[in-house]
């Protein structure tokens, strides 16, 4: 099995977590994708998901979470805006592929949100809300109720591990400021 790894993000209240989950394999492009939190000893809980089938470059918003699926680049962009201390935890992206179990995309993300602002010039505490206004065209999608217990303790099978970066360059011409997509490295 592929070893599960975590990437740690330490942010302050009010800031934005902005990450991507890469799925690379084209067969997953239109599959429904979800953002989950994993609490100790519990099943992963789905917080937001894309539509089914997942639409290309179409923001889906659930509360403070915005998902954008970029089929042409094999990535799901996840943003959690206006972070709160209680958002701290372990997160993961999964691809729903019923009737099979959800396909987990590594690496997991360990989010640590602390109180207060750093006050450092150039930091994003004051600008976060302005830069990341919620897109006016967002959609709320219904998420499947099932969650695989396998994703709690096990890595995906080796055959499904090809989920790395689609190191691609996105044409930003027809994309608004809030939907620019980080896709490299």
């Amino acid at each position: 099995a592929t070893k599960l790894t975590e990437e740690k993000y330490e942010l302050k209240e009010g800031q934005t977590l902005d990450v991507k989950c890469d799925y690379t394999l084209e067969k997953f492009a239109s599959s429904q994708k979800a953002w989950q939190i994993i609490r100790d000893g519990e099943m992963p809980k789905t917080l937001a998901c894309t539509e089914r089938p997942s639409k290309n470059s179409h923001p889906v918003q659930v509360g403070r979470i915005i998902l954008e699926d970029y089929h042409d680049h094999g990535l799901l962009r996840v943003r959690m805006v206006n972070l709160q201390v209680e958002d701290s935890g372990l997160y993961q992206c999964v691809i729903y592929q019923p009737p099979k179990e959800p396909h987990m995309l590594f690496d997991r993300i360990r989010l640590v949100v602390t109180k207060g602002f750093s006050g450092t010039p150039g930091s994003n505490e004051n600008s976060t809300q302005n830069v990341y206004k919620i897109p006016p065209t967002t959609t709320k999608a219904l998420c499947p109720l099932y969650t695989s217990p396998r994703t709690v303790t096990q890595a995906p099978p080796k055959s499904t591990a090809d989920v790395s970066t689609p190191d691609s360059e996105i044409n930003l011409t027809n994309v608004t400021d809030i939907i620019r997509v980080p896709v490299f490295n």
Partner: antibody
Amino acid sequence: EVQLVESGGGLVKPGGSLRLSCAASGFTFSSYSMNWVRQAPGKGLEWVSSISSSSNYIYYADSVKGRFTISRDNAKNSLYLQMNSLRAEDTAVYYCARRGGSSSTGLLYWGQGTLVTVSS
Amino acid sequence: DIQLTQSPSSVSASVGDRVTITCRASQDISSWLAWYQQKPGKAPKLLIYAASSLQSGVPSRFSGSGSGTDFTLTISSLQPEDFATYYCQQSLTHPTFGGGTKVEIK
């Protein structure tokens, strides 16, 4: 332990060709995109090319487009850079690099580099 | 292409000094910025990713901040081993690096 080892550098005349290799170990090579980054003597870092895990996303810097070809062999845990029509300005240390994880912005793992000198 | 402008290009400082390096992007890159340290003859070493996340094993005297177009790398108390060249790198589109900042001994 993640290790990246480049080879294939050397002295070549302008217009010549060279093939660089990067041998990867210590991680599931087939699960990660890979990059080539170069650094001319006394200059800064310049990204050259990237290839996704299954080779279906490939990108090049404008300065090398049409002359360089990136490829990989997941069965051999190897990354390659075929460099044709070499110019003096391609003289640099070439690094292969891998980012830390699936969501990070940073290139965490680097090889030791291999020097390519293009000179007549 | 997205340009990254680092300043200053060089700085002379003493052990114990607080050093601040800035990186300005030509367009909004959210938090998709990394900082590296490079010593002569060596490969770059990742210090900070996602603008403010400290890479594991990197001393806490290094910190990063910023979002959008303006970013900062701060070394709170310069140590002898910190004299090196520092680069910023964006990954919104294909990667580009800043021109580098050389931190020299005063």
